[in-house]
Protein backbone atom coordinates (compact mmCIF):
# COMPACT_ATOMS: atom_id res chain seq x y z
CA UNK A 1 0.00 0.00 0.00
CA UNK A 2 1.29 3.25 -0.99
CA UNK A 3 1.09 5.54 1.47
CA UNK A 4 0.71 9.74 1.68
CA UNK A 5 1.71 11.59 4.48
CA UNK A 6 2.82 14.84 5.82
CA UNK A 7 6.05 14.23 6.82
CA UNK A 8 8.82 16.18 8.47
CA UNK A 9 10.37 17.41 5.24
CA UNK A 10 6.91 18.29 3.89
CA UNK A 11 6.66 16.02 0.74
CA UNK A 12 3.26 13.96 0.71
CA UNK A 13 4.57 11.07 -0.59
CA UNK A 14 6.33 8.01 1.90
CA UNK A 15 6.80 5.85 -1.72
CA UNK A 16 6.38 6.57 -5.44
CA UNK A 17 4.85 3.99 -8.04
CA UNK A 18 5.39 3.38 -11.61
CA UNK A 19 2.76 1.05 -12.25
CA UNK A 20 0.76 2.06 -14.92
CA UNK A 21 -2.88 2.75 -13.77
CA UNK A 22 -5.95 2.38 -16.24
CA UNK A 23 -7.53 6.13 -16.92
CA UNK A 24 -11.00 4.70 -16.14
CA UNK A 25 -9.94 4.12 -12.78
CA UNK A 26 -8.60 7.25 -12.48
CA UNK A 27 -10.89 10.42 -10.60
CA UNK A 28 -8.21 13.53 -10.88
CA UNK A 29 -4.07 14.17 -10.67
CA UNK A 30 -2.59 16.38 -8.05
CA UNK A 31 0.66 17.61 -9.05
CA UNK A 32 2.51 19.39 -6.49
CA UNK A 33 5.94 21.25 -8.05
CA UNK A 34 9.03 21.00 -6.06
CA UNK A 35 9.20 23.69 -3.04
CA UNK A 36 7.17 24.44 0.45
CA UNK A 37 10.09 21.96 2.03
CA UNK A 38 9.66 19.35 -0.17
CA UNK A 39 12.61 18.72 -2.62
CA UNK A 40 11.18 17.18 -5.48
CA UNK A 41 7.93 17.11 -7.70
CA UNK A 42 5.11 14.81 -6.64
CA UNK A 43 2.31 13.59 -8.49
CA UNK A 44 -1.01 12.54 -6.37
CA UNK A 45 -3.16 9.90 -8.29
CA UNK A 46 -7.11 9.91 -6.77
CA UNK A 47 -8.54 6.54 -8.27
CA UNK A 48 -12.39 6.49 -8.19
CA UNK A 49 -12.14 3.53 -5.50
CA UNK A 50 -10.91 6.62 -3.76
CA UNK A 51 -7.68 5.10 -3.13
CA UNK A 52 -4.82 7.54 -3.49
CA UNK A 53 -1.31 6.43 -5.32
CA UNK A 54 2.23 8.77 -5.23
CA UNK A 55 3.18 7.79 -8.81
CA UNK A 56 6.92 8.56 -9.91
CA UNK A 57 7.05 11.80 -12.34
CA UNK A 58 9.62 9.67 -14.58
CA UNK A 59 6.64 7.20 -15.29
CA UNK A 60 6.10 7.17 -19.04
CA UNK A 61 2.56 7.24 -18.83
CA UNK A 62 2.04 9.58 -16.42
CA UNK A 63 3.32 11.96 -18.59
CA UNK A 64 0.71 11.44 -21.00
CA UNK A 65 -1.96 12.25 -18.44
CA UNK A 66 -0.25 15.52 -17.80
CA UNK A 67 -0.20 16.69 -20.57
CA UNK A 68 -3.84 16.42 -20.68
CA UNK A 69 -4.10 18.66 -18.09
CA UNK A 70 -1.24 21.17 -19.02
CA UNK A 71 -2.82 21.60 -22.51
CA UNK A 72 -5.98 23.02 -20.98
CA UNK A 73 -4.13 24.75 -18.17
CA UNK A 74 -2.34 26.92 -21.13
CA UNK A 75 -5.11 27.00 -23.53
CA UNK A 76 -5.84 30.67 -22.67
CA UNK A 77 -3.65 32.79 -25.85
CA UNK A 78 -1.12 34.79 -23.70
CA UNK A 79 -2.34 38.49 -23.97
CA UNK A 80 0.92 40.40 -25.33
CA UNK A 81 2.33 43.26 -23.03
CA UNK A 82 2.91 46.54 -24.87
CA UNK A 83 5.35 49.28 -22.80
CA UNK A 84 4.44 52.95 -23.11
CA UNK A 85 7.11 54.94 -24.18
CA UNK A 86 7.58 57.92 -21.25
CA UNK A 87 8.16 60.94 -23.80
CA UNK B 1 -14.99 1.03 -32.77
CA UNK B 2 -16.24 4.51 -32.00
CA UNK B 3 -19.07 5.55 -33.18
CA UNK B 4 -20.88 9.68 -32.72
CA UNK B 5 -23.66 10.56 -34.18
CA UNK B 6 -25.76 13.71 -34.15
CA UNK B 7 -29.39 14.44 -33.98
CA UNK B 8 -31.12 17.50 -34.44
CA UNK B 9 -34.37 19.26 -35.36
CA UNK B 10 -33.61 20.21 -39.01
CA UNK B 11 -35.57 23.01 -39.77
CA UNK B 12 -35.79 25.80 -37.16
CA UNK B 13 -37.54 29.65 -37.22
CA UNK B 14 -35.30 32.51 -36.47
CA UNK B 15 -34.65 33.23 -32.96
CA UNK B 16 -35.81 30.04 -31.53
CA UNK B 17 -33.48 27.94 -30.03
CA UNK B 18 -30.78 25.06 -31.12
CA UNK B 19 -30.60 21.59 -29.31
CA UNK B 20 -28.75 19.23 -30.50
CA UNK B 21 -27.72 15.46 -29.26
CA UNK B 22 -24.50 13.85 -29.97
CA UNK B 23 -24.99 10.38 -28.89
CA UNK B 24 -21.57 7.71 -28.83
CA UNK B 25 -19.96 4.88 -28.14
CA UNK B 26 -17.33 2.49 -27.27
CA UNK B 27 -15.98 5.51 -24.96
CA UNK B 28 -17.20 6.93 -21.83
CA UNK B 29 -16.83 10.36 -20.72
CA UNK B 30 -16.09 9.34 -17.18
CA UNK B 31 -12.72 8.47 -18.27
CA UNK B 32 -9.99 10.65 -17.56
CA UNK B 33 -8.65 13.09 -20.86
CA UNK B 34 -11.85 12.59 -22.86
CA UNK B 35 -14.28 15.10 -23.85
CA UNK B 36 -16.23 15.67 -26.83
CA UNK B 37 -16.51 19.04 -28.86
CA UNK B 38 -19.27 20.82 -31.25
CA UNK B 39 -17.81 22.19 -34.89
CA UNK B 40 -20.42 23.91 -37.60
CA UNK B 41 -19.61 23.76 -41.20
CA UNK B 42 -21.87 25.83 -43.47
CA UNK B 43 -22.59 24.45 -47.17
CA UNK B 44 -19.85 24.87 -49.38
CA UNK B 45 -17.56 26.27 -46.50
CA UNK B 46 -15.19 25.94 -43.82
CA UNK B 47 -15.70 24.25 -40.07
CA UNK B 48 -15.70 26.49 -37.14
CA UNK B 49 -15.44 25.22 -33.52
CA UNK B 50 -18.17 25.92 -31.18
CA UNK B 51 -17.67 24.41 -27.89
CA UNK B 52 -16.00 21.62 -26.17
CA UNK B 53 -16.53 19.54 -22.38
CA UNK B 54 -14.33 17.31 -20.61
CA UNK B 55 -14.89 14.36 -18.55
CA UNK B 56 -14.80 16.48 -15.11
CA UNK B 57 -17.76 18.54 -16.53
CA UNK B 58 -15.05 21.72 -17.48
CA UNK B 59 -16.32 23.57 -20.50
CA UNK B 60 -15.11 25.95 -23.25
CA UNK B 61 -16.95 27.87 -25.34
CA UNK B 62 -16.18 29.96 -28.88
CA UNK B 63 -15.98 33.59 -27.86
CA UNK B 64 -17.79 34.60 -30.88
CA UNK B 65 -20.87 33.03 -29.61
CA UNK B 66 -20.77 32.08 -26.13
CA UNK B 67 -23.55 33.80 -24.99
CA UNK B 68 -25.93 31.91 -27.27
CA UNK B 69 -23.85 28.81 -26.34
CA UNK B 70 -24.67 25.78 -23.74
CA UNK B 71 -22.96 22.73 -23.61
CA UNK B 72 -23.74 19.77 -21.11
CA UNK B 73 -23.65 15.55 -20.57
CA UNK B 74 -25.44 13.24 -19.59
CA UNK B 75 -21.98 10.51 -18.76
CA UNK B 76 -24.29 8.00 -17.89
CA UNK B 77 -26.47 8.11 -21.07
CA UNK B 78 -22.90 8.61 -23.43
CA UNK B 79 -24.37 11.55 -24.44
CA UNK B 80 -23.42 15.24 -24.78
CA UNK B 81 -25.87 18.08 -25.93
CA UNK B 82 -25.59 22.02 -27.28
CA UNK B 83 -27.84 24.79 -27.28
CA UNK B 84 -27.90 27.78 -29.53
CA UNK B 85 -30.19 30.21 -28.61
CA UNK B 86 -31.88 33.12 -30.65
CA UNK B 87 -30.59 31.53 -34.15
CA UNK B 88 -30.53 33.26 -37.21
CA UNK B 89 -29.83 32.37 -41.12
CA UNK B 90 -26.56 32.73 -40.41
CA UNK B 91 -26.20 29.44 -38.34
CA UNK B 92 -27.90 26.88 -41.12
CA UNK B 93 -25.32 24.67 -41.39
CA UNK B 94 -23.80 21.13 -40.66
CA UNK B 95 -23.55 20.41 -37.10
CA UNK B 96 -20.93 17.81 -36.25
CA UNK B 97 -19.55 16.33 -32.44
CA UNK B 98 -16.40 14.80 -32.73
CA UNK B 99 -14.65 13.60 -29.80
CA UNK B 100 -11.09 14.75 -28.22
CA UNK B 101 -9.02 11.85 -26.57
CA UNK B 102 -5.79 13.81 -24.61
CA UNK B 103 -4.32 15.54 -26.86
CA UNK B 104 -5.87 14.12 -29.89
CA UNK B 105 -8.29 17.18 -30.66
CA UNK B 106 -11.20 15.40 -32.45
CA UNK B 107 -9.71 12.21 -33.43
CA UNK B 108 -13.16 10.49 -34.11
CA UNK B 109 -16.36 12.10 -36.03
CA UNK B 110 -19.95 11.90 -36.10
CA UNK B 111 -21.80 12.03 -39.84
CA UNK B 112 -23.18 15.68 -39.25
CA UNK B 113 -26.83 16.83 -38.68
CA UNK B 114 -28.34 19.50 -41.11
CA UNK B 115 -29.76 22.46 -39.66
CA UNK B 116 -31.66 25.14 -41.37
CA UNK B 117 -33.07 28.35 -40.56
CA UNK B 118 -35.99 29.95 -42.41
CA UNK B 119 -39.02 31.93 -42.26
CA UNK C 1 -7.71 34.44 -32.09
CA UNK C 2 -5.28 32.37 -33.65
CA UNK C 3 -6.24 32.98 -37.40
CA UNK C 4 -4.85 30.05 -39.47
CA UNK C 5 -4.00 30.72 -43.29
CA UNK C 6 -3.93 27.77 -46.13
CA UNK C 7 -2.18 27.85 -49.10
CA UNK C 8 -3.02 27.47 -51.82
CA UNK C 9 -6.77 27.35 -52.06
CA UNK C 10 -7.44 24.76 -54.52
CA UNK C 11 -3.95 22.10 -55.53
CA UNK C 12 -4.16 20.49 -59.23
CA UNK C 13 -2.27 17.23 -58.98
CA UNK C 14 -1.14 14.63 -61.05
CA UNK C 15 -1.90 10.81 -59.82
CA UNK C 16 1.37 9.86 -58.33
CA UNK C 17 3.48 12.71 -57.61
CA UNK C 18 4.15 14.74 -54.41
CA UNK C 19 1.33 17.77 -52.97
CA UNK C 20 2.43 20.44 -50.41
CA UNK C 21 -0.21 22.34 -48.40
CA UNK C 22 0.95 25.40 -46.36
CA UNK C 23 -0.44 26.60 -43.09
CA UNK C 24 0.76 29.78 -41.16
CA UNK C 25 -0.67 30.73 -37.90
CA UNK C 26 -1.13 34.52 -37.13
CA UNK C 27 0.69 34.25 -33.31
CA UNK C 28 2.96 31.12 -32.42
CA UNK C 29 0.66 28.26 -31.74
CA UNK C 30 3.31 26.81 -29.40
CA UNK C 31 2.14 26.51 -25.50
CA UNK C 32 4.24 27.24 -22.37
CA UNK C 33 4.39 23.61 -21.55
CA UNK C 34 6.27 23.22 -25.30
CA UNK C 35 4.27 21.70 -26.95
CA UNK C 36 2.03 22.66 -30.28
CA UNK C 37 -1.32 21.04 -31.21
CA UNK C 38 -1.31 21.27 -34.93
CA UNK C 39 -3.22 18.82 -36.80
CA UNK C 40 -4.45 17.97 -40.09
CA UNK C 41 -7.72 16.52 -41.34
CA UNK C 42 -8.97 15.64 -44.52
CA UNK C 43 -12.60 15.93 -45.60
CA UNK C 44 -13.37 13.92 -48.47
CA UNK C 45 -16.51 14.59 -50.90
CA UNK C 46 -20.15 14.45 -48.70
CA UNK C 47 -18.08 12.59 -45.64
CA UNK C 48 -17.27 13.81 -41.98
CA UNK C 49 -13.49 15.25 -41.52
CA UNK C 50 -10.64 12.66 -40.63
CA UNK C 51 -7.92 12.82 -38.61
CA UNK C 52 -4.52 12.45 -40.11
CA UNK C 53 -1.70 14.19 -38.24
CA UNK C 54 -1.55 15.41 -34.87
CA UNK C 55 0.91 17.70 -33.08
CA UNK C 56 2.50 18.67 -36.00
CA UNK C 57 4.11 15.34 -37.15
CA UNK C 58 2.51 12.45 -35.47
CA UNK C 59 0.49 10.28 -37.94
CA UNK C 60 -2.62 9.41 -36.47
CA UNK C 61 -3.72 5.79 -36.66
CA UNK C 62 -4.05 4.23 -40.06
CA UNK C 63 -3.02 6.74 -41.92
CA UNK C 64 -0.24 6.26 -44.40
CA UNK C 65 2.90 6.67 -44.26
CA UNK C 66 2.95 9.08 -47.28
CA UNK C 67 1.31 11.90 -45.49
CA UNK C 68 3.62 13.84 -43.27
CA UNK C 69 3.71 16.91 -40.99
CA UNK C 70 6.37 19.52 -40.39
CA UNK C 71 6.47 23.04 -39.38
CA UNK C 72 6.91 24.96 -36.00
CA UNK C 73 6.34 28.52 -34.68
CA UNK C 74 3.32 29.52 -36.94
CA UNK C 75 4.97 27.75 -40.37
CA UNK C 76 3.67 24.11 -40.92
CA UNK C 77 3.28 22.16 -43.94
CA UNK C 78 1.33 18.67 -44.88
CA UNK C 79 3.00 16.57 -47.64
CA UNK C 80 1.68 13.98 -49.24
CA UNK C 81 4.55 11.69 -50.84
CA UNK C 82 2.56 10.17 -53.91
CA UNK C 83 -0.79 11.23 -54.70
CA UNK C 84 -3.44 8.48 -54.85
CA UNK C 85 -7.55 8.79 -55.72
CA UNK C 86 -8.51 8.25 -52.60
CA UNK C 87 -6.91 11.28 -50.87
CA UNK C 88 -9.16 14.15 -53.31
CA UNK C 89 -10.65 16.20 -50.86
CA UNK C 90 -10.74 19.31 -48.77
CA UNK C 91 -7.61 19.51 -46.15
CA UNK C 92 -8.03 21.49 -43.26
CA UNK C 93 -5.09 22.66 -40.58
CA UNK C 94 -6.50 22.96 -37.05
CA UNK C 95 -5.06 24.64 -33.78
CA UNK C 96 -5.78 23.20 -30.61
CA UNK C 97 -3.43 24.85 -28.91
CA UNK C 98 -5.30 28.16 -27.54
CA UNK C 99 -9.21 28.99 -27.02
CA UNK C 100 -11.15 29.37 -29.64
CA UNK C 101 -10.08 26.28 -31.34
CA UNK C 102 -9.96 27.58 -35.50
CA UNK C 103 -9.26 25.88 -38.40
CA UNK C 104 -7.89 26.93 -41.67
CA UNK C 105 -9.60 28.08 -44.33
CA UNK C 106 -9.19 24.60 -46.74
CA UNK C 107 -7.17 23.53 -49.48
CA UNK C 108 -9.27 21.40 -52.07
CA UNK C 109 -6.73 18.96 -53.72
CA UNK C 110 -8.07 17.89 -57.24
CA UNK C 111 -7.52 16.12 -60.26
CA UNK C 112 -5.27 17.83 -62.82
Known amino acids: VLEVYYTSLRCRCVQESSVFIPRRFIDRIQILPRGNGCPRKEIIVWKKNKSIVCVDPQAEWIQRMMEVLRKRSSSTLPVPVFKRKIP | QVTLKESGPGILQPSQTLSLTCSFS??????????VGWIRQPSGKGLEWLAH???????YYNPALKSRLTISKDTSKNQVFLKIANVDTADTATYYC???????????WGQGTTLTVSS | DVLMTQTPLSLPVSLGTQASISCRSS???????????LQWYLQKPGQSPQLLIY???NRFSGVPDRFSGSGSGTDFTLKISRVEAEDLGVYYC?????????FGGGTKLEIK
Open chain 2, 98 to 108: ARIDGYYDFDY
Open chain 2, 26 to 35: EFSLSVFGMG
Open chain 2, 53 to 59: IWWDDEK
Open chain 3, 27 to 37: HSIVQDNGNTY
Open chain 3, 55 to 57: KVS
Open chain 3, 94 to 102: FQGSYVPYT
